[in-house]
């Protein structure tokens, strides 16, 4: 069968990983800085904690990071500034064992959503210095243009 | 119990710089989802929105005044400020601060204070 | 910006009535971020409604909200004496987010 000039078009694309994770003096939150990992498109653009989107439209985005931490439940939320507002997107939670050792849970999510164009996305962890492993295979995020 | 409270000069005379302060307990702004906004009401009048910031420092001011205005925090010590440079006459209302419950898709400036009123007057 | 038309300006109604205020914006509003707040004389403006149609803590079930797109009401099925107030919509679907001018209710 012959692809349609519709089917050929490519839909945008970026997984992005982590370089670090922060956590101000002040604040009760701990943000992931990221870098693309693959990316393909020009829709969505990182910079630093967050992900500028560029072209609006319908997008799946998803969410993970593994945690190792000994606070009774961790998790994170992926959060959109834009309009002047902020709001979480979705979040995901864990319930953590209380021992050191066996404190290592991942907690992935995802979902689709209209984003607009200026929108900032970026992972918020509501835990001031919350211990992170930072692979690239266990702490990603990602958006595909639907 | 989340309140809060402004206060300011009262009075002062056209071209000073207004300096408002909001101070507020039952809630911290170093919180996610969580800002503080300025709303001011000329007496008899509607309310207009001035400027808010946000937990992570973000500052969003109103268009028209932007050049005028400069919204910052002290985390530490649950206060949020708002100056207002160059004032006129066109500047007298009562001031209002508001929590903005950030974070869900149902939030609002859910909290007033209870307003500081403020006369720009030669 | 997006202006919020309220009326009317100025309502009179006897106790029991059923009341309705409007609200009307000049492009669409997504009703998730549509506002209404209630001030007496004197006092701080409160948060009313929220999202269009969910009362905040504490309103009475006799108030409601609807509307979509460029229309919104606020309805109180029977008119009680501590209704008396202004009543502001308030907009934040589009930046910056604006207020209606107000619709004063007041007790014949």
């Known amino acids: 069968a012959v692809l349609t000039q519709k089917q050929k078009k490519q839909h945008s694309v970026l997984h992005l990983v982590p370089i670090n994770a922060t956590s101000k003096d002040d604040s009760d939150v701990t943000e992931v800085m990221w870098q693309p990992a693959l990316r393909r498109g020009r829709g969505l653009q990182a910079q630093g904690y967050g992900v500028r989107i560029q072209d609006a439209g319908v997008y799946l985005l998803y969410s993970q990071v593994l945690f190792q931490d000994v606070t009774f439940t961790m998790g994170q939320v992926v959060s959109r500034e834009g309009q002047g507002r902020q709001e979480t997107l979705f979040r995901c939670i864990r319930s953590m064992p209380s021992h050191p050792d066996r404190a290592y849970n991942s907690c992935y999510s995802a979902g689709v959503f209209h984003l607009h164009q200026g929108d900032i996305l970026s992972v918020i962890i509501p835990r001031a210095r919350a211990k992170l492993n930072l692979s690239p295979h266990g702490t990603f995020l990602g958006f595909v243009k639907l | 119990q989340v309140t809060l409270k402004e206060s300011g000069p009262g009075i002062l005379q056209p071209s000073q710089t207004l300096s408002l302060t909001c101070s507020f307990s039952g809630f911290s702004l170093s919180t996610y989802g969580i800002g503080v906004g300025w709303i001011r009401q000329p007496s008899g009048k509607g309310l207009e929105w001035l400027a808010h910031i946000w937990w992570n420092d973000n500052k969003y001011y109103n268009t028209a005044l932007k050049s005028r205005l400069t919204i910052s925090k002290d985390t530490s010590n649950n206060q949020v400020f708002l100056k207002i440079a160059s004032v006129d006459t066109a500047d007298t209302a009562t001031y209002y601060c508001?929590?903005?419950?950030?974070?869900?898709?149902?939030?609002?400036?859910?909290?007033w204070g209870q307003g500081t009123s403020v006369t720009v007057s030669s | 910006q997006i202006v919020l038309t309220q009326s009317p300006a100025i309502m009179s109604t006897s106790p029991g009535e059923k009341v309705t205020l409007t609200c009307s914006a000049s492009s669409s509003v997504s009703s998730t971020y549509l506002y209404w707040y209630q001030q007496k004389p004197g006092s701080s403006p409160k948060l009313w409604i929220y999202s269009t149609s969910n009362l905040a803590s504490g309103v009475p079930a006799r108030f409601s909200g609807s509307g979509s797109g460029t229309s919104y009401s606020l309805t109180i099925s029977s008119m009680e004496a501590e209704d008396a107030a202004s009543y502001f919509c308030?907009?934040?679907?589009?930046?910056?987010?604006?207020f209606g001018a107000g619709t004063k209710l007041e007790l014949k």
């Open positions: 308030h907009q934040w679907s589009s930046y910056p987010p604006t």
């Open positions: 508001a929590r903005i419950a950030g974070g869900n898709y149902d939030y609002a400036m859910d909290h």
